[in-house]
């Protein structure tokens, strides 16, 4: 079994998958909004969803951070919480929504002239899965001050979307995060119906681009509630 993986920092007890993958008839492949989906056409709903447990911010979605759900709560019980918007109180950068950072306890905008050059953040991948480089040497990725002066291009390692160049977001790729293209109109998207209601998406998608929202594709309205295809559509 993969219990050892489930007990690692990277994967906790996965919540039910979101409905959303729709196969292409006659094709040997299906497009899936998130990479951890069951076989067949029966998808569980998330009506009885339990909050997604976490040990560190990197386990949560791009618009979430990992913390105890109650003030002064048990530090051992942490879940993915919705990120804090501008002018909200914070204790660290990860608490602030993409495009913002934590300054003097308040989430403020990361404008183009301000780079967190003094911060060096390290992605530590201390999960149960072995991760080795293809050339056989282990690698630890450090995001130094230089990264904040050159916005990450597609495929660059990132911590959050503000690290990526325009048109890209920071999305999970295995147990790292890389800059991927923001979704365009008509592209399949992942609809998280409730904050934090995602499993670990090993191949995570970006969010829909400006002026677009992730909605049920019109011709899929008649499909069963749990297997609807969501695409980026104009507001």
């Amino acid at each position: 079994t993969l219990n050892s993986v489930l007990n690692s920092n990277a994967i906790k007890n996965l919540p039910p998958p979101l409905g959303g993958a729709a196969g292409h008839p006659g094709s040997a492949v299906s497009a899936a909004p998130g990479i951890l989906y069951p076989g067949g056409n029966k998808y569980q709903t998330i009506d009885n969803y339990q909050p997604y447990p976490c040990a560190e911010d990197e386990e949560c979605g791009t618009d979430e951070y990992c913390a105890s759900p109650t003030r002064g709560g048990d530090a051992g019980v942490q879940i993915c919480l919705a990120c804090r918007k501008r002018r909200k109180r914070c204790m660290r950068h990860a608490m602030c929504c993409p495009g913002n950072y934590c300054k003097n306890g308040i989430c403020v905008s990361s404008d183009q002239n301000h780079f967190r050059g003094e911060i060096e953040e390290t992605i530590t991948e201390s999960f149960g899965n072995d991760h080795s480089t293809l050339d056989g040497y282990s690698r630890r990725t450090t995001l130094s001050s230089k990264m904040y002066h050159t916005k990450g291009q597609e495929g660059s390692v990132c911590l959050r979307s503000s690290d990526c160049a325009s048109g890209l977001c920071c999305a999970r790729h295995f147990w790292s995060k890389i800059c991927k293209p923001v979704l365009k109109e008509g592209q399949v998207c992942t609809k998280h119906r409730r904050k934090g209601s995602h499993g670990l998406e090993i191949f995570q998608r970006c969010y829909c681009g400006e002026g677009l929202s992730c909605r049920i594709q019109k011709d899929h309205h008649q499909a069963s509630n749990s297997s609807r295809l969501h695409t980026c559509q104009r507001h």
């Epitope: 299906s30 991760h131 293809l134 991927k180 293209p181 399949v188």
Partner: nanobody, 117 residues
Framework: EVQLVESGGGLVQAGGSLRLSCAAS????????MGWFRPAPGKEREFVAG????????YYADSVKGRFTISGDNAKNTVYLQMNSLKPEDTAVYYC??????????WGQGTQVTVSS
């Protein structure tokens, strides 16, 4: 449209070996990486092994570490899973998946691996 086709599954005795292949065709975009997954009783498809072309890394689940080896050729759009010292609990349909830069994530149809004791 990308199509992923797995092959190499079959029936093998415990302790034996198999080599799975996954070939991607119809790709017009680059791939960030590919992975192998398998279902577990009462659970979603679970991660087995993965290879990231972008990061130059390979990843393994603890349960297969030291027994399975993932390799591949991004230029040939192919990924392999060499499975050694197979155990009955490795019996499953093995699925290949790809993290594509066109924002779609693609699944193959799967190949059955059966390990008899």
């Amino acid at each position: 449209e990308v199509q992923l086709v797995e092959s190499g599954g079959g029936l093998v005795q415990a302790g034996g070996s198999l080599r799975l292949s996954c070939a991607a065709s119809g790709r017009t975009f680059s791939s960030y990486g590919m992975g192998w997954f398998r279902p577990a009783p009462g659970k979603e498809r679970e991660f087995v092994a993965g290879i990231s072309w972008t990061l130059g890394r390979t990843y393994y689940a603890d349960s297969v570490k030291g027994r399975f080896t993932i390799s591949g050729d991004n230029a040939k759009n192919t990924v392999y899973l060499q499975m050694n010292s197979l155990k009955p609990e490795d019996t499953a349909v093995y699925y290949c998946a790809s993290d594509e830069s066109d924002a779609y994530n693609y699944w193959g149809q799967g190949t059955q691996v059966t390990v008899s004791s």
